[in-house]
């Protein structure tokens, strides 16, 4: 019986010869825990591990700390891969983060960070980002320096309010900050003047709720 091959991310899947978009099973080294992730094998050379996707409002993103920790949703559709997996993965080697955005007028934009990692759960999965390029704003819509992750049951933001309860969704809220890609999904023609929507301030402003978002990571040397 042949040895079971395991992949830590979609870059390894790609390099093994699997170059078709789809859901793959990933396992961290020295771990038996498996996660199912969508791999984008076409965009920008492929090998992208999708860690978040919004596209139609089919999944509720107002979830608990534990749910954001382990992940939820459908990897073929809307989902969150899981903070614990992403934290462990991004602390093993250097990763880039690409955030792809779609508005309701048919426009697309992206933000690319040349270095991305999440701190451990003990440090509230704080986000760390460096080196922004892209078309979705010259200023980072994820506050810098990075903030701790907050959910409806874990208020780690810098506001005298509770950002996650008010804006909905788990995110690296400041007070409350220029973005929230896990906010309430609003359909077309109901997506403006919505402070609790899917926001990327330095592309579309404060009250605009986006049509679609994808957060994807890949090793820096890929």
């Amino acid at each position: 019986k042949g040895e079971q091959i395991s992949f830590r991310d979609c870059a390894e899947v790609f390099k093994s010869g699997h170059t078709t978009n789809g859901v793959y099973t990933l396992t961290l080294p020295n771990s038996t825990e498996e996660v199912k992730a969508y791999c984008d094998m076409e965009a920008g050379g492929g090998g992208w591990t999708i860690i978040q996707r919004r596209e139609d409002g089919s999944v509720d993103f107002q979830r608990t700390w534990k749910e954001y920790k382990v992940g939820f949703g459908n990897p073929s559709g809307e989902y969150w891969l899981g903070n614990e997996f992403v934290s462990q993965l991004t602390n093993q080697q250097r990763y880039v983060l690409k955030i792809h955005l779609k508005d309701w007028e048919g426009n697309e934009a992206y933000s690319l960070y040349e270095h991305f990692y999440l701190s451990s759960e003990e440090l509230n999965y704080r986000i760390h980002l460096k080196g922004l390029t892209g078309t979705a704003g010259k200023i980072s819509s994820i506050s810098q320096p990075g903030n701790d992750f907050s959910t409806k049951d874990a208020d780690n933001d810098k506001c005298i309010c509770k950002c996650s309860q008010m804006l909905t969704g788990g995110w690296w809220f400041d007070a409350c900050g220029p973005s929230n890609l896990n906010g309430m999904y609003y359909p077309q023609r109901q997506n403006t003047n919505k402070f609790n929507g899917i926001k990327w301030y330095y592309w579309k402003g404060s009250g605009y709720s986006l049509k679609g978002t994808t957060m994807m990571i890949r090793p820096a040397g890929f």
């Epitope: 506001c159 005298i160 008010m166 409350c176 220029p178 309430m184 402070f195 929507g197 301030y201 009250g207």
Partner: antibody
Framework: EVQLVQSGGGVVQPGRSLRLSCAAS????????MHWVRQAPGKGLEWVSY????????YYADSVKGRFTISRDNAKNSLYLQMNSLRAEDTAVYYC???????????????WGQGTLVTVSS | DIVMTQSPLSLPVTPGEPASISCRSS???????????LDWYLQKPGQSPQLLIY???NRASGVPDRFSGSGSGTDFTLKISRVEAEDVGVYYC?????????FGQGTKLEIK
């Protein structure tokens, strides 16, 4: 610690001008919309003016429109209210106030300055 | 402009007893995003106002849990479960759903 320190109040004759200042510290001033709210002696609160984080959006109460000008200098972390053609009914304590939430989300006033008294009298 | 009407205007309360303040608006404050842009502020004697409740029912950090806000549309209530001496001052409701923002006339809470 968030602080809003006001200055510039005083006694002024009707028809004259006065400029109020509000120096901000302890937060990223350029990310927040700011307001002026006033309170006539022994009376309630009245909103006066708003300026967005970048200064691109400005609103005034009808009672001061055309006479008062709100402005900000994000490099100096400062908010201003230029008051011209002052009237006796403008006599009040003027407060600067910061939006609760950043990036121009209007959900109330999370922090207030200490207030400065403007007295318009001949 | 939206008219905000508070009652009572004066509220004498015995320490340890509950208190309730009503705020009514001349139009609905329910925004299309499902939130009521209704805040409550307390102005203690000789001090600047301070935020107590935002978006109708959300307590600001540092505000004791004896304070609670409720209501939707045009009728809102601020409740203090057990009044303490430090709660004296003037309470204001303020709406931000419709421009310009407008305040209620204030309710003066005093200790009996």
């Amino acid at each position: 610690e968030v602080q809003l320190v006001q200055s510039g109040g005083g006694v002024v004759q009707p028809g004259r001008s006065l400029r109020l200042s509000c120096a901000a510290s302890g937060f990223t001033f350029s990310s927040y919309g700011m307001h002026w709210v006033r309170q006539a002696p022994g009376k309630g609160l009245e909103w006066v003016s708003y300026i967005s984080s970048s200064g691109s959006t400005i609103y005034y109460a009808d009672s001061v429109k055309g006479r008062f000008t709100i402005s900000r200098d994000n490099a100096k972390n400062s908010l201003y209210l230029q008051m011209n053609s002052l009237r006796a009914e403008d006599t009040a304590v003027y407060y600067c106030a910061r939006d609760l939430l950043d990036y121009d989300i209007l959900t109330g006033y999370g922090y207030w300055g200490q207030g400065t008294l403007v007295t318009v009298s001949s | 402009d939206i008219v905000m009407t508070q009652s009572p205007l004066s509220l004498p309360v015995t320490p340890g007893e509950p208190a309730s303040i009503s705020c009514r608006s001349s139009q609905s404050l329910l925004h299309s995003n499902g939130y009521n842009y209704l805040d409550w502020y307390l102005q203690k004697p000789g001090q600047s106002p301070q935020l107590l409740i935002y978006l109708g029912s959300n307590r600001a950090s540092g505000v004791p849990d004896r304070f609670s806000g409720s209501g939707s549309g045009t009728d809102f209530t601020l409740k203090i479960s057990r009044v303490e001496a430090e709660d004296v001052g003037v309470y204001y409701c303020m709406q931000g759903t419709h421009w310009p923002p407008t305040f209620g006339q204030g309710t003066k809470l005093e200790i009996k």
